[in-house]
Structures are given as C-alpha cells and as structure tokens.
Interface confidence: low
Amino acid sequence: KSPIFGPEEVNSVEGNSVSITCYYPPTSVNRHTRKYWCRQGARGGCITLISSEGYVSSKYAGRANLTNFPENGTFVVNIAQLSQDDSGRYKCGLGINSRGLSFDVSLEVSQGPGLLNDTKVYTVDLGRTVTINCPFKTENAQKRKSLYKQIGLYPVLVIDSSGYVNPNYTGRIRLDIQGTGQLLFSVVINQLRLSDAGQYLCQAGDDSNSNKKNADLQVLKPEPELVYEDLRGSVTFHCALGPEVANVAKFLCRQSSGENCDVVVNTLGKRAPAFEGRILLNPQDKDGSFSVVITGLRKEDAGRYLCGAHSDGQLQEGSPIQAWQLFVNEESTIPRSPTVVKGVAGSSVAVLCPYNRKESKSIKYWCLWEGAQNGRCPLLVDSEGWVKAQYEGRLSLLEEPGNGTFTVILNQLTSRDAGFYWCLTNGDTLWRTTVEIKIIEGEPNLKVPGNVTAVLGETLKVPCHFPCKFSSYEKYWCKWNNTGCQALPSQDEGPSKAFVNCDENSRLVSLTLNLVTRADEGWYWCGVKQGHFYGETAAVYVAVEERKAAGSRDVSLAKADAAPDEKVLDSGFREIENKAIQDPRLFAEEKAVADTRDQADGSRASVDSGSSEEQGGSSRHHHHHH
C-alpha cells in the first residue's frame, strides 16, 4: 500500500481555485525526491502537469504551482482559473510517475449556478441555520407571507404566515414578521440538510401586486481535513461546532459503507469496543468544542471520521458536522511494542514504553485509562520523581534501556490492576502508546517473605528465592524510592530449597542490612534483569522498631529444615510471578511476540503484540497498609 495520501475528491466551481495537499513519510530520501501532479489517461498512463523540478505543462502555464514542505512531509498543488475541462482523475506522487508511490485524486469542476436576476445567494454549512430575508411593500403588509421551493418546474409551498409548514421542514423552520417599522419578513431554517439546497421564492401577497424575492440556498458538505498519522501512534480530532450546539450531545463517528456512520464515542457514554482503552473524549468547553484523542492507531482505524452534535449522540440528517480523512502510515517510526502484557496476581509486570528518541530529555509519564464518563487518564508516575500515593512501593518508571524506550515496573499485582495504561511524554504528542495489563492465573516465580520488621542497630537478612529458569539472569536487590530503585549489595547464598523440581541452578540471594537505622525503613525489591531490560520483581516492606533483645534477625520463608515438598509457604510470605518478560528472547525489542508454542510451558513469556480482541476490566486505586 502506498504511503502517499491526499484528498480522494476535490470539488470546485468554474473560475475558482483549488489547493491540494499531498502527504508523504518525511524520510530524508522522500524529502528530496521529485514530487509530481499528473493526469490519468484513458489507457492508464499519467501525464505530468507540474513537478517540483520546475516542469509546468502548457495547460497549467501561469495558473498553477507546486510547493514542497519537506519539514512537514507535504507538498501542495495550487491550480487557479478552473474550467470544466479540468475535471478528471489525477495522481499526486513521488519519484517517477509509474512507480506507484502516489495517491489518486478525483477533481470535479462544476458550472456555477445559473441564477435569476435579483437572486440572493445563501451559502451555509450542513447542519447550520439560514435566515432568508424577504422585503415587501406597505400595500402587502397585512397580506399572506410565504416561502416556496422550486422543485423541478413547480414551486412547492414550504411555509406561510397562516401556519402551514411543509412536512419536510417540521420542527426546524419558522416565519418571523418584523415589527411595523420594518417591511421585512424572515424565514429561519435550522439543522440544514443537503436536500434543502435549491432555489426559493419569498412572496408577500397573492395577487399581481405581490412582492417576490428569489433566493438560492447552497448547503455545503464539509470538506474532510486530511490527517496523516503513524501506525501505533496517536491522533487528536479537534471539533468546534459552535456555541449554538453547546448543550447538545456530541459524537465522533467513523463512516462505514454508504452513508452509515458508526459511533466511535459520544458524550452520552457510548464507546465502540474497538477503541476501548485507547480513546479519550476531552471535556467540552462552554462554546461546545471538544477533542477526541485516539492512541495505538491500527491499520483498520483509517477512514473518514465525522464529529457532530445531535440529541441522540449519533449522526442524523441536519446534524452540524466536521469531517476528517485519517490515513494510517504503515511505514511507522514508532516501534512495535507489546499491546497486551500478562502478569500473575501478586506478581509484577515490566512494560516497555517507546518515545521519540530525539527527545531523550523529555519527561516520561504513565497514566491509567479510565472509561468512566468520556474517558480520562490520571497520571500514576513520572520520570521527575512523582508517584501517585496509592502506588508507592510498587510502581517505578525507569529511563532504561533509553534510546527510545523507557520501562515501567508495577508489582504486587491484584485483579484491580487489569486495564489499559498509556505511555506519554511531554514531547511529541503523537507518541502516546497504549498497553493492556491482564491478570492471569499461575504460579509465582520469585519467593520473598511477607512484610518484615527490623530492629534498630541490629542486622537484618532478607532472602529472595529465584527458580532455576532465571539462572542466566542478573539478580538484584534494590531499595524503592519515588525516583526509581537504588541497587544494593546482595549475597548469593547458593541453591534454594524453596522449589520442587528445580536443580542446583535455583538461587537464594539475600539482602543484608547492617546496623539498621530508621532510614532503612521502606520498600525493597528483588528482581531479575538482563542488561537494561527488566524482568520480574518481588517487593518486601521493611519496618524498623526499637531494640527489644540483642542479636541479629534472619528472615526466612519457613523453617530451614523443611522438606522440599512440604507445604511451608503460608501467609508469612508472598509468591510473585511475572509472565510478561521471562523468556530472554523478549528482551530484544523487535522480538516482542513469543512463539505460540512457548505458551504451553509455564516458564515461558506471555506477551501479545498487535491488536487484542479481549478487553480487560478497568482498574481502581490501590492502598497499602505499611
């Protein structure tokens, strides 16, 4: 599929001008290559009319130009003094005409309306309001006032001053007669439809002395604004319909076959399942304008979108609308990353978030999408040292691995953590990505004690048991704070006895705190990583209390002489597992999709990439009791 994008249809009137914008991926090659506008012939060729290399066909001499905007990835073709001969099929493209790096554009130039003398032209947008003014003379002041519409050869009564209203206009038309001082009556038509367009005749009086006035009503369907965004990226539709519909329900819909427009989201609480977790309808302003943000763009999101206002929250005849044509560029600069990450309850997940690598110094954020009302995304953590209070001790945003990716680790998972999360930065707004966290059944991997109490001035040793599947991973202990997790020295105590069917490759790694102080109180994590790519973590809260008796504390999972198959793992410890990144292959960004054959083995990763049919529940706030 060609990554070039432009308007599918351009309509204009004889004598007018058009401006046609074509979009291309702004790679360095594309920025400097030839741009062209050509007309398609009956036998398939395409004859160049104008190009960026200075060529202008004699047909376009003195009335057309082509301007490249390499920084935006666009070029614009302006054509003036249009005639009906200009109607036809064209291509805008890059390189050579036959190469296929192009987009088809249909240009239709119509004749200007043939108007009667003394005809007032009203040009109004679809869904809006028109006021047709009709002057009359004093002798007709007391006589019947009427408005007719010319249908074919015959005038059809639309409204009159005796109370008649044509059924096609019921509920959206009125006839106002001005005060005695002004010899004028007005007909106001609301919620204009395309079918309202045409020639009208105002009349005051019914005899040969009646006053008549011709009006031509042109109802404009909005030209779609072209929007060109990257696959996996984000788009924002800004919808400003005007203060007259400030209190009417708003919607964004996507046109499917024919005239159907399927609601994507509306202010009445409807949201299409395909957009769950990746859409926000930003609150309306007083003037009725609003915006809709969609993240995690997919190929199938491409198409024509309309925003509008109607009490039903969906497109109806006469809704005022705004239109966009969204093109999703598959030659995306946004790297693939898992769209679904699975973790076991009590476990952890490590989420990789892409960002624009040119903006390494930007602030990174992670927020939780909430579907209530029209969607919102309250922040949970940032790279500047802020963590939402309810997430203290179990959430960390790390700048690693860097170079276009940051990591978010969330541990102590519960079913309430299932839901959609957004990765954001304060830089390029197109790089908003979405990940769904799913909580699944399973056995935990890392084993740590429950919350631990240390004694002031004494030594505390906290164990972390790593199964053999992590034998090739780096094992670490760190102390959590709101800027990350600071690494601490730890001791490998040899094989662990905490696992059944696990050989000498299992490991018991201890954290030792000597001469405990009040400053040692807090959350500690043990975890695994490979280089700058993080895997599973487990968290322990260490409380510090006054000395009661001399000696050191050695916290173990259970009594040391327990047989491997004994059920000693009770409420005094926590088992934590992360199914998100366990297979070392997953640490390579480009290999985010584990082979499905790996899924049968519990030791393998469970990461989905691409769109997911399943939807997770929404998350709530989480509270710790320290």
Epitope: T236, P378, L379, N426
Partner: nanobody, 125 residues
C-alpha cells in the same frame, strides 16, 4: 516556547469574588496536552500551590485552604484557564501566577515548565 498572560486581578472587598484568566500562546501550542495550575505568592512568603487541572480536564485539585471557595476550569478552544475565587479573605492577598506543565497535574505536586508574570489580587477588610 509557551507564553502565559494572566488577567482579572484587582482590588476586592472581603467576601467578594474575582475571576482570573490565563491566556496561553505559542508557535506549536497543543493546549490540551498541558496540565495547568494557579499558584500565589504573598509578600514575604514562598510561592504556594492554589489549584490545578489536568491535561484532559479529567481531574482538578485544590490546596486545602481553597477547597470549596475556588474553582479552576479550562477552555481548550480558547487556550485559557480560569480561576473563580469566591468568599475572598484578606489572607488571599497575593500575586497569582498561572503555570503550565506538559501532560501534567497530579495532586498538589505540579512541576511547571512555564510561568506567567502574575496578576495582583488585593482583598481589603
């Protein structure tokens, strides 16, 4: 670069109301991507947080002493953020500053990227 300009300050009697407005402008401003906040600084005191509203208007936060009296709102179409102040007290006398943070606001912690010049509010008893 984002420029913030406050307006609406002035002299008001205790118990009265004022509405402050902050207009944001900038060459590449995507106003709906900024969290917005109001801070104030009384003579001889440190600048303190007043209220904030998040990037998509989903949440508002207020300093405890201003809850119920002050209301923050935003109009993304006009690139403005407003602060409605009711039941004003002499203690509310200060220079009020508008602040912006890309994507940001959460509780009373607000790491502003941009600041306005401030507008003086004086509450007389």
């Amino acid at each position: 670069q984002v420029q913030l300009v406050e307006s609406g300050g002035g002299l008001v009697q205790a118990g009265g109301s004022l509405r402050l407005s902050c207009a944001a402008s900038g060459r590449s401003l995507g106003f709906d991507t900024y969290g917005m906040a109001w801070f104030r600084q009384a003579p001889g005191k440190e600048r303190e947080f007043v209220a904030s509203i998040d990037w998509n208007g989903g949440s508002t936060y207020y300093a405890d002493s201003m809850k119920g009296r002050f209301t923050i709102s935003r109009d993304n179409a006009k690139n403005t953020v407003n602060l409605r102040m009711n039941s004003l007290k002499p203690d509310d006398t200060a220079v009020y500053y508008c602040a912006a943070a890309r994507y940001y606001t959460s509780s009373t912690y607000f790491p502003a990227n941009y600041w306005g010049q401030g507008t003086q509010v004086t509450v007389s008893s």
